[in-house]
């Protein structure tokens, strides 16, 4: 996981701060007992902002120690600061917990930029604004880190919600969500509604604001409109999916669909941007540039280096295209599309020097590790991680930022052939052939 472009901190306001809250539409599929309905105690349990991550409050140990924990669907370790650090307001003090058990094993996690390392143990963990359960979970107590914690952030750890295959040091370390499902009656599913603010938030606004919801064990009707559409989880490691087509303002990028998933496509709440493989990024930028050519933006804007600004309240959203990703559907030869607006891929940035204007950063960037559907995508949708049925659901988020002319959309079905060919098969090192 590339910590450099990956998130770490906080998000917008609940509801539809700037944007019109969409009306409820008709009911979707038949009810599934225990899997949907109202989860009032979990609604609005996330805070943060898209540029620095979304966090949930958790308690660890006995007596409970409260920590803010970054919600990350792109990793699989539950890891918390466990030693003083200049950027941490508080940290997990194992010696104060009567239920802490040392696993006498270390863990080291390097990123492209930076790293964290620590000691493995288990302890009792609960989520105050989550299901009313306590579980014994693996915890990596971070004792040393470099470029991991963020100055001025409000979180002290990370909750990796992906699968055991990518857990460190190896896949024998059971991730938190697996422990939760095994030890309780919580269904094997969670859903995320990340609410981008649509405008920059200062520190005090962030701390006082709501950033969305993590519904553990179910689906909350109030958080989305229209229907939920599901795409298969291709492989249980990251939350890997298959993109079969990409359109900019309805114009097909016309690339071999393997390029869209080279070397994988994942849904990752721990990444800010929509990250695209080099070739796809270049084609997408070319197309977005062409669509928005009524204004001349600096090259640095497309690189994420320069901001673009407009006089407050005059952002010309209409000159920017919508972006549609077609995802493999659950039925053979059927796909559906998710469509985001510039309100999702232009990220509001507060800059004192230009405070009289509304300024934005282009939040689509280049990747060397495949497509990453980060907060930029997720802020448009209510995303259901249905692990039990090995699928991810998308519906239009009730809190997504939009204008009076366009909204994000989830639409289908579309007929798409040979979708299996769109998946890239990462070459596996056959260790059995290595000399020992």
């Amino acid at each position: 996981t590339q910590h450099g472009i990956r998130l770490p901190l906080r998000s917008g306001l609940g509801g539809a701060p700037l944007g019109l809250r969409l009306p409820r539409e008709t009911d979707e599929e038949p009810e599934e007992p225990g899997r949907r309905g109202s989860f009032v105690e979990m609604v609005d349990n996330l805070r943060g902002k898209s540029g620095q991550g979304y966090y949930v409050e958790m308690t660890v140990g006995s007596p409970p120690q409260t920590l803010n924990i970054l919600v990350d669907t792109g990793s699989s370790n539950f890891a918390v600061g466990a030693a003083p650090h200049p950027f941490l307001h508080r940290y997990y003090q194992r010696q104060l917990s009567s239920t802490y058990r040392d696993l006498r094993k270390g863990v080291y996690v390097p990123y492209t930029q930076g790293k964290w390392e620590g000691e493995l143990g288990t302890d009792l963990v609960s989520i105050p604004h989550g299901p009313n359960v306590t579980v014994r979970a693996n915890i990596a107590a971070i004792t040393e880190s470099d470029k991991f914690f963020i100055n001025g952030s409000n979180w002290e750890g990370i909750l990796g919600l992906a699968y055991a295959e990518i857990a460190r040091p190896d896949d024998s370390l059971e991730p938190f969500f697996d422990s939760l499902v095994k030890q309780t009656h919580v269904p094997n599913l969670f859903s995320l509604q990340l609410c981008g603010a649509g405008f920059p938030l200062n520190q005090s606004e962030v701390l006082a604001s709501v950033g969305g919801s993590m519904i553990i064990g179910g689906i909350d009707h109030s958080l989305y409109t229209g229907s939920l559409w599901y795409t298969p989880i291709r492989r249980e490691w990251y939350y890997e999916v298959i993109i079969v087509r990409v359109e900019i303002n309805g114009q097909d990028l016309k690339m071999d669909c393997k390029e869209y998933n080279y070397d994988k496509s994942i849904v990752d709440s721990g990444t800010t941007n929509l990250r695209l493989p080099k070739k796809v990024f270049e084609a997408a930028v070319k197309s977005i540039k062409a669509a928005s050519s009524t204004e001349k933006f600096p090259d640095g804007f497309w690189l994420g280096e320069q901001l673009v600004c407009w006089q407050a309240g005059t952002t010309p959203w209409n000159i920017f295209p919508v972006i549609s990703l077609y995802l493999m559907g659950e039925v053979t030869n059927q796909s559906f599309r998710i469509t985001i607006l510039p309100q999702q891929y232009l990220r509001p940035v507060e800059d004192v020097a230009t405070s009289q204007d509304d300024c934005y950063k282009f939040a689509i960037s280049q990747s060397s590790t495949g497509t990453v559907m980060g907060a930029v995508i997720m802020e448009g949708f209510y995303v259901v991680f249905d692990r039990a049925r090995k699928r991810i659901g998308f519906a239009v988020s009730a809190c997504h930022v939009h204008d009076e002319f366009r909204t994000a959309a989830v639409e289908g079905p579309f007929v798409t052939l040979d979708m299996e060919d769109c998946g890239y098969n990462i070459p596996q090192t056959d260790e059995s052939t290595l000399m020992t």
Partner: antibody, heavy 116, light 107 residues
Framework: EIQLQQSGTELVRPGTSVKLSCKAS????????MHWVKQRPGQGLEWIGM????????NYNQNFKGKATLTVDTSSGTAYMQLSSLTSEDSAVYYC?????????WGQGTTVTVSS | DIVMTQSQKFMSKSVGDTVSVTCKAS??????VAWYQQKSGQSPKSLIY???HRYSGVPDRFTGSGSGTDFTLTISNVQSEDLADYFC?????????FGGGTRLEIK
């Protein structure tokens, strides 16, 4: 308050290297790119290159490739520029400047004098 | 590389006058031009971005205009503290380039 605090004056020998620093404060360091600009005595401004602190991606002016190397330390919020194989042509004031729209914030500058 | 030309190297004005500093780009840079003021022995100070937007805290005596290839910084009601070098910069494409500067002297 946003500040870019640069390291002090350097008097260096020809052929050697020097590493200048620029410590940022008052904003999230990894959110904005850092640029370096050269100004020779009584002359104009020349863009050297830039670095993205979040990914350590760099982009150099062709004229400074091989001369300047840009790095960052995100844990301390500091950007660095190393200048190598110094000659009298490298005697100048070097500024770091933060991205935004153009360069809204500038450091106070570091004077480098190359002399034997 | 885009060349930014400030044809006037020096300008001399009296307090209260209006002065126009011009800058010409060798190719179309849209409105992606900034202006900086540099007083003797100091670092550059940002004045104008996007050709005509004032940075926060810049007095409204400073006005930018232009697009494409021709840009102007106008200082009305010139004050003695405006004694400085003024540089234009294009940030439309890499490498970013600056004009050679115009020195404003106060009579």
């Amino acid at each position: 308050e946003i500040q870019l605090q640069q390291s002090g004056t350097e008097l260096v020998r020809p052929g050697t290297s020097v590493k200048l620093s620029c410590k940022a404060s008052g904003y999230t360091f990894t959110n904005y790119w850092m640029h370096w600009v050269k100004q020779r005595p009584g002359q104009g401004l020349e863009w050297i290159g830039m670095i993205d602190p979040s990914a350590a991606y760099t982009n150099y002016n062709q004229n400074f490739k091989g001369k300047a190397t840009l790095t960052v330390d995100t844990s301390s919020g500091t950007a660095y520029m190393q200048l190598s194989s110094l000659t009298s042509e490298d005697s100048a004031v070097y500024y770091c400047a933060r991205s935004g729209v153009a360069f809204p914030y500038w450091g106070q500058g570091t004077t480098v004098t190359v002399s034997s | 590389d885009i060349v930014m030309t400030q044809s006037q190297k020096f300008m001399s004005k009296s307090v209260g006058d209006t002065v126009s500093v011009t800058c010409k780009a060798s190719q179309d840079v849209g409105r992606n031009v900034a202006w900086y003021q540099q007083k003797s022995g100091q670092s550059p100070k940002s004045l104008i971005y996007s050709a005509s937007h004032r940075y926060s805290g810049v007095p409204d005596r400073f006005t930018g205009s232009g697009s494409g290839t021709d840009f102007t910084l106008t200082i009305s009601n010139v004050q003695s503290e405006d004694l400085a070098d003024y540089f234009c910069q294009q940030y439309n494409s890499y490498p970013y380039t600056f004009g050679g500067g115009t020195r404003l002297e106060i009579k």
